[in-house]
């Protein structure tokens, strides 16, 4: 802790501004007033101060706010957030997309770090639910955000935010995730007509069932293999050799290069070899 | 339930000294600053000092000298020692958690000092 | 020190009147300013803190306003139970804490 001093003559802060970078640690937590501190945090990122001088004013607003700091100045925080804890955080209540938005700046081009996951979480569970805008936000931030949430918490996404989602997003979600996200999808985009709606839900299709796959194989969809090879096992079992074919129309050849992989290996080992003969690739059940 | 006690007020002389105590139910005093305000019969609030979560003291101006404020974490209670008493002294004394900016959330119920000859 | 006036020091309203108690800070205390109840032999309770947020219980008629040196506790719809005093506190956090309560307010029902 700083050495209990006091602020010498004339040196009482009445701005933050640049002079305060001349103050030595002890000075700097004697001579400003943490109030004025809180009111005008937006000038501090302004100010090239030190790591130790930062350390001083982090104290100085948790000495005035134990509990959390106020939104007022969550929102003006700056780089001096990345001095923030998790512990820190979860006394939080951030409300504004704005702080959410300005916090997430300065992490910007970093990996997802215990602090902005746990600011995440807070704002997601004051929020109640994970709507479009705060999607659009974190997925802008952090492509993988989507994929890295239990699918307890996908369950909170509200159908209209689905159409926040890019395919990108969606990279590195499993099954589970896409189990859950894939019904939502379905009814965002129920009313697309059939081109529009198979580019829309093609990335979500990992957590097709099969009867949706055999609806796709009557609408001349051309799937690519690359979409085929997510789907899940237990739902391409069931389909047809004319199904499939119908499902990934000039796209079937590449049937032969994944024969070795799953879901294709499971299926092929389904398949009737008359039928599998009719799609002329040499694939043998 | 949060509760904060005060003791060790009572009728003291001119010049003499007396400690109040602040014991805590349901709360960790370790974990929060705390303050101590008194109030005069009939009359205002007046802020005494605070101890922060560290053990730093703030006080009033007034209250510098004469008035010591520490706490005993493992006894979970909070003191306030007074030297020095004088009539102007007299007042109920209260004890209160800080809570967040600037403000104090739980008071005890406070204790009566009188200093008179 | 930081000084704390209130005003008015009395005031007398009907049950539904919208109340304003006002408080002037001697400097700028920017927003950090809090508002307490207190009535006869009891400790104060805290209503509002940083000017203007509720404090947990505490009924939605007060709110509070102001910033710098100016600040205003507003009860938009005057009960039985609001009579009391009602004290402003503001200060100074740097080496010392120039805390300062005002002289208080006594709110009477006609």
């Known amino acids: 802790e700083v050495e209990k001093t006091a602020c010498p003559s004339g040196k009482k802060a009445r701005e933050i501004d640049e002079s305060l970078i001349f103050y030595k640690k002890w000075e700097l937590e004697a001579c400003v007033d943490a109030a004025l501190l809180a009111t005008q945090m937006d000038r501090v990122n302004a100010i090239p101060f030190t790591y130790e001088q930062l350390d001083v004013l982090k104290h100085k607003l948790d000495e005035l706010y134990p509990q959390g700091y106020p939104e007022s100045v969550i929102q003006h925080l700056g780089y001096l957030f990345l001095k923030m804890s998790p512990e820190d955080i979860r006394k939080w209540n951030v409300t504004s997309l704005e702080t959410l938005k300005a916090l997430l700046e300065v992490n910007k081009g970093h990996e997802m770090s215990p602090q902005v996951a746990t600011l995440i979480d807070r704002f997601v569970k004051g929020r109640g639910q994970l709507d479009k805008d705060t999607l659009d936000t974190l997925t802008a931030f952090y492509p993988g955000y989507l994929c890295s949430l239990s699918p307890e918490e996908l369950s909170s996404v509200p159908p209209s935010s689905i159409w926040a989602v890019r395919p990108q997003d969606l990279d590195t979600c499993d099954p589970r995730q896409l189990d859950v996200l894939y019904p939502k999808a379905r009814l965002a985009f129920q009313n697309m007509n059939g081109s529009e709606y198979f580019v829309k839900i093609q990335s979500f299709l990992g957590g097709a069932p099969t009867e949706d796959l055999k609806a796709l194989s009557q609408q001349n969809v051309s799937m690519d293999l690359a979409t085929f090879m997510k789907l899940r096992t237990d739902a391409v079992l069931p389909l047809t050799v004319a199904e499939v074919q119908k499902l990934l129309g000039p796209h079937v050849e590449g049937l032969k290069a994944e024969e070795r992989h799953r879901p294709v290996r499971d299926w092929i080992l389904r398949q009737r070899q008359d039928d599998l003969d009719t799609l002329g690739l040499g694939l043998q059940g | 339930q949060v509760q904060l006690v005060e003791s060790g007020g009572g009728l003291v002389q001119p010049g003499g000294s007396l400690r109040l105590s602040c014991s805590a139910s349901?709360?960790?005093?370790?974990?929060?600053?705390m303050g101590w305000v008194r109030q005069a019969p009939g009359k205002g609030l007046e802020y005494i000092g605070t101890i922060n979560i560290g053990g730093r003291v703030y006080y009033a101006s007034w209250a510098k000298g004469r008035f010591t404020i520490s706490r005993d974490n493992s006894k979970n209670t909070l003191y306030l020692q007074m030297n020095s008493l004088r009539a102007e002294d007299t007042a109920v004394y209260y004890c209160?958690?800080?809570?967040?900016?600037?403000?104090?959330?739980?008071w005890g119920q406070g204790t009566l000092v009188t200093v008179s000859s | 020190d930081i000084q704390m006036t209130q005003s008015p020091s009395t005031l007398s309203a009907s049950v539904g009147d919208r109340v304003t108690i006002t408080c002037q800070a001697s400097e700028s205390i920017y927003r950090v300013l809090a508002w307490y109840q207190q009535k006869p032999g009891k400790a104060p309770k805290l209503l509002i803190y940083?000017?203007?947020t509720l404090a947990s219980g505490v009924p939605s008629r007060f709110s509070g306003s102001g910033s710098g040196t100016e600040f205003t506790l507003t009860i938009s719809s005057l009960q039985c139970d609001d009579a009391a005093t009602y004290y402003c506190q503001g200060g100074y956090y740097a080496d010392s804490y120039g805390i300062a309560f005002g002289g208080g307010t006594k709110v009477e029902i006609k």
């Open positions: 209160a958690r800080y809570y967040n900016g600037g403000s104090y959330d739980i």
């Open positions: 940083d000017t203007s």
């Open positions: 349901g709360i960790d005093l370790s974990s929060y600053a």
